[in-house]
């Protein structure tokens, strides 16, 4: 029996060098979320938990931020970041539930056809 | 092939501890999702303890109101082994208890539906 429900932004795209937020949102229980973490494949990037707020991972400091709200900012974004996320919120008294976004990074369409635009 | 062994169940008096184990074989997954369940004469299965673990670093141990306080439940990744450690036993602990592993890691809580079941360890607690 689930109770909840996660839900993600999916698999979603983002150019290189920019930003992108990785949302998810909990619905359909009552249950108290003590924490979330975040993964990046096998890697922990942040946890939020409820009394302690906010811990970035060290190796993740300058290019992710906290939210907005239990979501997760990613910035100065490279290739390498293309990959699967996930968002595990540990509840009381249900338990773990996790979401899952794929993320693909793309080369700047402006770096990649900026020849194209040039003003003669 | 995911199979399930427990061990570690017996006869004790009430107040008395007891440590069960849970080796896994063919339950390889970067993320986990494991319990312990129990079930008493004439009662339905009911979950105790789970455990969810990624290869990420998380570890979230969630318990059925009854047992929070008094059971643990914890890991040796190396050993593929899950243990409950149950301290301060009351009569009403009495059962067989059962390991499960789920494949799906969606949810993982006392609730949510398991996929793969060990035999089972009897344990009775005595007043």
């Known amino acids: 029996m689930m109770t909840g429900t996660i839900e993600t932004t999916g698999n979603i795209s983002a150019e290189k060098g920019g930003s992108i937020i990785l949302q998810c949102h909990l619905s359909s229980t009552t249950a108290q979320v003590t924490q979330v973490n975040w993964e990046q494949q096998d890697q922990l990037l942040a946890i939020c938990n409820a009394d302690l707020g906010w811990h970035i991972s060290p190796s993740f400091k300058d290019r992710v931020a906290p939210g907005p709200g239990l979501g997760l900012t990613l910035q100065s974004l490279t290739v390498n970041d293309t990959g699967e996320y996930f968002c595990i919120y540990h509840t009381y008294p249900d338990g773990t539930y996790t979401g899952r976004i794929f993320l693909e990074v793309l080369e700047s369409s402006v770096a990649e056809h900026g020849a194209r635009f040039q003003i003669p | 092939q995911v199979q399930l062994v427990e061990s570690g169940g017996g006869s004790v008096q009430a107040g008395g501890s007891l440590r069960l184990s849970c080796v896994a074989s063919?339950?390889?997954?970067?993320?986990?999702?494991r319990g312990w369940f129990r079930q008493a004469p004439g009662k339905e299965r009911e979950g105790v303890a789970t455990?969810?673990?990624?290869?990420?670093?998380?570890?979230?141990?969630t318990y059925a109101d009854s047992v929070r306080g008094r059971f643990t439940i914890s890991q040796d990744n190396a050993k593929n082994t899950v243990y409950l450690q149950m301290n301060n036993l009351k009569p009403e602990d009495s059962g067989i208890y059962y390991c499960a592993a789920r494949l799906s890691t969606d949810f993982c809580g006392p609730r949510a539906d398991f996929d793969y079941w060990g035999q089972g360890t009897q344990v009775t607690v005595s007043s």
């Open positions: 455990l969810y673990t990624s290869s990420g670093g998380t570890y979230f141990d």
């Open positions: 063919g339950y390889t997954y970067s993320r986990k999702c």
